[in-house]
Structures are given as C-alpha cells and as structure tokens.
Interface confidence: medium
Amino acid sequence: SDKLYQRKEPVISSVHTKVKGIAEVTENVTEGGVTKLGHSIFDTADYTFPLQGNSFFVMTNYVKSEGQVQTLCPEYPRRGAQCSSDRRCKKGWMDPQSKGIQTGRCVPYDKTRKTCEVSAWCPTEEEKEAPRPALLRSAENFTVLIKNNIHFPGHNYTTRNILPTMNGSCTFHKTWDPQCSIFRLGDIFQEAGENFTEVAVQGGIMGIEIYWDCNLDSWSHHCRPRYSFRRLDDKNMDESFVPGYNFRYAKYYKENNVEKRTLIKAFGIRFDILVFGTGGKF
Amino acid sequence: SDKLYQRKEPVISSVHTKVKGIAEVTENVTEGGVTKLGHSIFDTADYTFPLQGNSFFVMTNYVKSEGQVQTLCPEYPRRGAQCSSDRRCKKGWMDPQSKGIQTGRCVPYDKTRKTCEVSAWCPTEEEKEAPRPALLRSAENFTVLIKNNIHFPGHNYTTRNILPTMNGSCTFHKTWDPQCSIFRLGDIFQEAGENFTEVAVQGGIMGIEIYWDCNLDSWSHHCRPRYSFRRLDDKNMDESFVPGYNFRYAKYYKENNVEKRTLIKAFGIRFDILVFGTGGKF
Amino acid sequence: SDKLYQRKEPVISSVHTKVKGIAEVTENVTEGGVTKLGHSIFDTADYTFPLQGNSFFVMTNYVKSEGQVQTLCPEYPRRGAQCSSDRRCKKGWMDPQSKGIQTGRCVPYDKTRKTCEVSAWCPTEEEKEAPRPALLRSAENFTVLIKNNIHFPGHNYTTRNILPTMNGSCTFHKTWDPQCSIFRLGDIFQEAGENFTEVAVQGGIMGIEIYWDCNLDSWSHHCRPRYSFRRLDDKNMDESFVPGYNFRYAKYYKENNVEKRTLIKAFGIRFDILVFGTGGKF
C-alpha cells in the first residue's frame, strides 16, 4: 500500500533457476529405408540450455533435418515456390522464406513437382508442421526451482525468496503454499489460464512475475515476494508474425571428411522471470 | 509529456526476436596444401545463437583455427613475443596475451623466428586481422522481427508492439512505417548514423531503444512504442580495451581417438533491445 | 546526494564483458584400464560460454560422464535408491532424483548393491562430490574487462565507464584505482569478503554492482560509476535447494553409427552485473 511519507526505491534483482524432470519421447525413426518406433529419454542436458539470468527455456517439441550438406539441390516446394521453367528462377536471388540462394535452374523436386535449384544446406528443411501432440508433452510435470536475491541499495537491505525454514520438497500452490519457490510447469500454465499441452506444440513465452512490496520500517517490517503468471506471447498472432516460440540450432560433424550438420528446429516454452517492486522506508 | 497529477509507473517488459536472412560467404580454403576459393551458405542456425531476452547476436565475420590439439608448440610470434634463448622463457608463466603456459624453452616458430614453447591448444591461434571486407557483410540485408510485450502491473494494463491490424511483410521506416516492428539491419545502422560494412569487420554493439510513453487515462488514452537506435560500443576505443565485439567458441571432436577442436573467433553485432518508459494514470 | 529540485531519471544500461586467462588442469584419466595423471589447458573458449548481456559465467570445476548411450542400466545407488526385489521398482516411474524411467526390474549395480533398472543415458551419472580443490581453481587470477554504456534518454545524456584517458593495463583497486574497469576475479571475491578457492568447488553467484549517481547540471556536473561487490547465492542454503551454481550440458557425437554423449556437470561462478542509479538535472 502507498505510504506517502516513505522514501521508495526500486528493487535490484538476481535470479537463478534449476529445472528438473525427464521426458520419454516416442517418434518414428527411419533407418536404411525402414521406419520403426524409436524411444528416447531426454534429461535437462537434452531439453534445456545453459542460460543466464532472467530466462530459461524448456524444449517441448522439435523437427530434425539430419545429415545436411552444403551443395546444390531443389528448394522445398512450399506454396508459391514451384516452377515449370528456368525463367521462374533468378540466379543469385534469396527468397526470405527459402533456405538458399537460387542458381537460376528449375529442377525436379520429386516425380510431380519442380522447384528452383538453390545453393544451400541440402536436402533443404521440409516445412512440415510441428508434431502434434508435442514430443516432450510430459514436460508439463517438470519442476523449476527459482532462487531470487533482491537488494535495495539505498536502504542497504538485502533478502531472498528462499528462507532457511522452507522445505525443499514443497510445490508452489496459490492457496496452500504461496511462498514455495518450486513450481510445476503445468501449474504455472493452469494459473495463467493456459493449456500446456496446446502451447507445447508451437511453443510460447510465459511470464513468472515476482512482486516485492517491501515496507522496511522496523515497526511494521514486511518483505516477501508474491508470484503471478501470465502468457507473454500472442496466441492469436497472424502467421506472418511467427506465432509461438521456436529457434533453429545445428549440430555439426564430419563424415568421410565432409562437413555435415543436423538442423534442429526447437519449439518450447521460454519462461521470463520479471522481478519488480519497491522498498519503502521512513 | 509530464502530467504531474498522474501516478507514473515504470514499464515491465518481455522481448522476443527472430532474425531472417541467408549469407553467401566466399573465402580461401586450404586443403592438402592447395588453396582454392570456397563458397558456403550461412543461415540463422550458422550465424546466430539461441539467446534469451533482450539481446541477439549476428555473426558478421570470423577467423578459424582448425584441428587444434592439446600439446606443446611455439607460441605465436606477436610483437614482443620472440626469443633468442631459453633465458627469455619462464617455465609456468602465463602471459595474458598468450594462449598457453610456457615450458621454459625457446624453439623455432618458422625459418626466421623463435618463440617460447607453450603447453596449449596447438597450433596456437594466429593473431591475424579480421578479414576485410567482412565475410558475412551481406548480413546488412537480414531482417529482425521484434516482439515486445509490456505490462504496468500497478495499472493492471498490458499491451504489445504488434497489433492485429499490422502487416507481416512491412519494413520499419522512421517516416513511412514507424510502427512496423520488422527491421532491416542495414537500416538500423543508417538510422544510428553508422556504416554497417565498416562495423561488420570488427563487430560492435547496437542499441534498439523502445520507448513507451503511455497515458492510460480513458479520456486521452495513448500507448504505442517509439523506436530509436544508437551505437553502444565505443568506436574510438583504444586497442588495449578490445574494440568491437567478438568472442571465441570451440567445436570439439575426436579424430583417431584424439580430442581436437576448431576454434572460432566470431565477430559480429550484438543488438541490445532497451525498453523503457512509464504508464501514467490519474 | 538528494537534490529535491532536480528531475531524476533511472539509468538505461548496456554491458559488455571480456574474460582473459588460462588454466592448467591436472586430473586422473582412465584409458584402457590404466589410470594416469592428465594435464590440460583451458582457455576462454573452454571455460566460458558466449553469453549476452549482464551476466558472464566462468567454469571453475566439473564432473564428466563420458560416452553415455541411450539404453537400459541400473540407476545410481544413491541414498534410498537400492532395492532387493522387483516389487520396489515401478514400471514407468520417474524419480525426480533419478536420471531415467524405471522398467520395473531390480538388477545388480555392483557385487553388493542392487538398484532399479532404468531407461536412460547409460551408465547413469555417478553422484560424486565435486572435486576438491576445484580443477580450475587458478581462475582466481583471470581478469574481466567490463564495458558499460549508460543513457539518460530524458536528459539526452550518454556516457561510459571507460574514458579515453584510461590505461588498458590497469587493475581495479578500491583505493588506488577505483575507476579501472579491469577486475581480477580473486579481488572481486576478496572485496565481497568471500573465499574464491572455497566457492570455486561448488560454484556460486557474484554480483558486481555499478552505481551511477549523476548530477547533470552544468555547474556541478558529475557522472562516474562506483563499483561494489556482493555474493548473491546463499552459502548457507539447505542441500534440497541446490546450493552453489552448476548446470549440465552435453557434447553429442556418433561412434559406429551409435549416438553418444559426454555429459558435463559444470560448476562455476556466474557474475551478474547490476547497473543502477539516477541522473538528476534542474
């Protein structure tokens, strides 16, 4: 509450997060022309990345393009990309949607379709839908521990969200345990009125707001965090503005002295921890 | 404008960026003692990194040290590093400029020069100039989509820079389209009065400032972002303070059961998105 | 000092860091059943990661699990994890502490102990203590250059912590050189009253606070930074809340067409650069 006689100061904050959980992923794997069901285990080193600061990312879905090599090949025949003759293909042209630079030739992509040849990582990435349901949909049961250290330098006051009296096997609940700083990812979504299973397919951004409203006067001292959750990406966003949350990264390797890469398009949830508030003192 | 009767509140912000573009890189490649011109394509997975939050990085230039192995070798003969006898080399000494730990021996680097032997990743990195012009100078034509979600918790007000009415094929222009949030990298530099081609060689830091001056009173409601651009690194910086922007990273691999690495010194532009402003309400 | 007649404005800040230093690491290496002492050199590409913004990380210790493959194996026999029959193992169960998904079988881990079989990256990570003393304890002598560009947009004022008159071979000292922005990591810890050698074992988070108290009136202009240091993680934290600072990451590779990984549990110091302050002008 506003105490007008107090000197207010904004919070200086540092955040540390730790995600826990294992996902079992079942997907079709093609090897030597034979497709079979493959099972694999993803642990924190597989689905999250060493990130600093006020964000952490949990991969919930992916599309892989394996064994790409730098060469010439037909580009992917997405809407409007097909050609019937070389006239349609412009040497040196880089279509922002494409994954390479056109050579000027129109070549067969498969038995029925022709596309412009490109210099690119080949075969070019197929523009297929993200798997549905999401491959790591069980990430809903992962938990994240959030440690938050705050400081009001002008008042020379420091505290943190985790107190010595807290129990490390708790799980945050708005009513039963609002001070616990271990959060189940599915609960964060539920609190924000969002469906984890749905968002996990295309990815998204979720805000975890930590609000410190601190009264630092000795006679009525109070300084504990309040947690709230809200979705930060626009779920109604137009296709052209890239809905959801994904990024591409590559694993490079050499095979028979040829540089190759596996391209991974990773969809997932980026959690942004937004710490704000003030410390007031007479 | 300052309305003194209003209660002002600082903005809470979350940013998501998406870079698009392909670069064709031509450089000399030496293999089996033969140097020839190599062409390669760089897409987002090659020139940018999965980063969180208010920064993104675009690699515009690089120097590679391939096939390094942990062993003993002469250090690079940079200015002041040459020796004529073992007396000049101090066992266990780590010169901050060097890349290894001295063994105490003075050994031939090439036919004309001797340097102190070091325990290091060998051969040690050659301290050569960044290629000029920059290898990925065409990054000037890349575009970045910036999504910004803001919140004034005290006023319980949330909005974003991208509105449903916006067109996903626009490009930001200060006069013609100041609300479009897709920016051509070259335009950002031009707006900031900087030369992309020049900065791309050594790298640099560019600030994209998003200013929200929000009047949240219903009778004169206004809350849209204003974009501006300024260079954040010091282009006149003394050599000793490391001008430009670069970092080193490594790709590790095994060859004949020996651990090796390729060291990449990546130069590029780090874009910092600085969101600020206030929301005022009676 | 507070000048009530001034219009105060919070600082907008951008930070760039550059770490320098080499560490020699000596550890036991087992190959072909023979254990011998291995020496290796770590440079910036080995112990730090390309990070953006207001944080940088220096690895000071690590535990490696080499050559893991996805298969079935007994889980690590940590406290409470042993079994005597299949009844104790629940098919499909994921113990948050475990590294895999139980198959329902109780199998021998070694001659004396049995544990539940899991589908996981095998062999599962041994839960051994971080090496003591820390493997990269010599990181105490590394230095970091911190470049800080600040802006008060309302006052249209920009400056930076590094001035043209500064000497690039200085080292920060609270008394002798309080404006030098090159910091020895060990000195940062000393200033904060912490023991680097101790913290390096489990890792931790160190805050570097940069306070700008700027008077922008022309007749009494002053705008220089003041540096201070404080530990941000809780050194007295209960085991269950994961004391120190570490994260796991993996290096993936293929051997005989089998996907493998080396898992690295990296302990280290995350340095958070916390920039705050105000610019006041009549």
Epitope: - | N257 | E66, G67, Q68, V69, V107, K111, C122
Partner: nanobody
Framework: EVQLMESGGGLVQAGGSLRLSCAAS????????MGWFRQAPGKLREFVAS????????RYIDSVEGRFTISRDNTKNTLYLQMNNLKAEDTAVYYC????????????????????YGQGTQVTVSS
C-alpha cells in the same frame, strides 16, 4: 595375471550349431564385462558379442543378432557363446576377452577396451 582358455571350436556345416567356452584363471573376472571377438583370414579382428559383469546386459554385432547368445557363469569364472544357424561368413578364429573399461555400455564393441589373453579357437563353417 589372467589366463583365458577358449574351447569348443571345430568344423560344422552351414545351419549347424556350436557352443564356445572360455575359462578364466589367475584371478576372478566376475567384476568385468567380457566379450567374444573373431578374426577371419586377411581381415581385422571384429567384435561379435559382449556381456556386462552381472550377465544382465548383452550386446551383439548386427550380423549375429538372433543367432548367437552370449552368457556367463560367474561361479565357474566361465564365458559362453552359443552359435546357432551358422553361416560360411562366420568362419574365423574366435577370441575371448575381458573388458577393461571405461564405460561398458558405450565401449563394449571397441577392441582397445579389452585385454586378450587367449590363443583363440578356430570355427570353420562349410557350405
């Protein structure tokens, strides 16, 4: 010093079976993974099958999967290889070896991870 003695080889017709044994002496090998390797004339020594120290996990080269079975009896310090439906390409000298490590799960097929002390036993499959 460990001694390994292979036995059970011989001449057999295609489609037939053999059971190889490997007796260890000198020290107990029950703490170690163990494996069978083979070497055909003019070829490199290749991995055939391996079993971890407890006998719970087994690994095979693709060409023998489903035809060969590796097993061990730790009370007798003995390793076995049951070979069914033999083919002409199985002709080779078969060696038994014990695994030195590290990491059996990952390196079970790598000859440099084993110590070979046996003389080998010849298996000839006639078509």
């Amino acid at each position: 010093e460990v001694q390994l003695m292979e036995s059970g080889g011989g001449l057999v017709q295609a489609g037939g079976s053999l059971r190889l044994s490997c007796a260890a002496s000198g020290r107990t090998v029950s703490d170690y993974g163990m494996g069978w390797f083979r070497q055909a004339p003019g070829k490199l020594r290749e991995f055939v099958a391996s079993i971890n120290w407890s006998g719970i996990y087994t690994r095979y080269i693709d060409s023998v999967e489903g035809r060969f079975t590796i097993s061990r009896d730790n009370t007798k310090n003995t390793l076995y290889l049951q070979m069914n439906n033999l083919k002409a390409e199985d002709t080779a000298v078969y060696y038994c070896a014990y695994f030195l490590g590290p990491n059996w799960y990952s390196n079970y097929g790598r000859p440099s991870s084993y110590d070979f002390y046996g003389q080998g036993t010849q298996v000839t499959v006639s078509s």
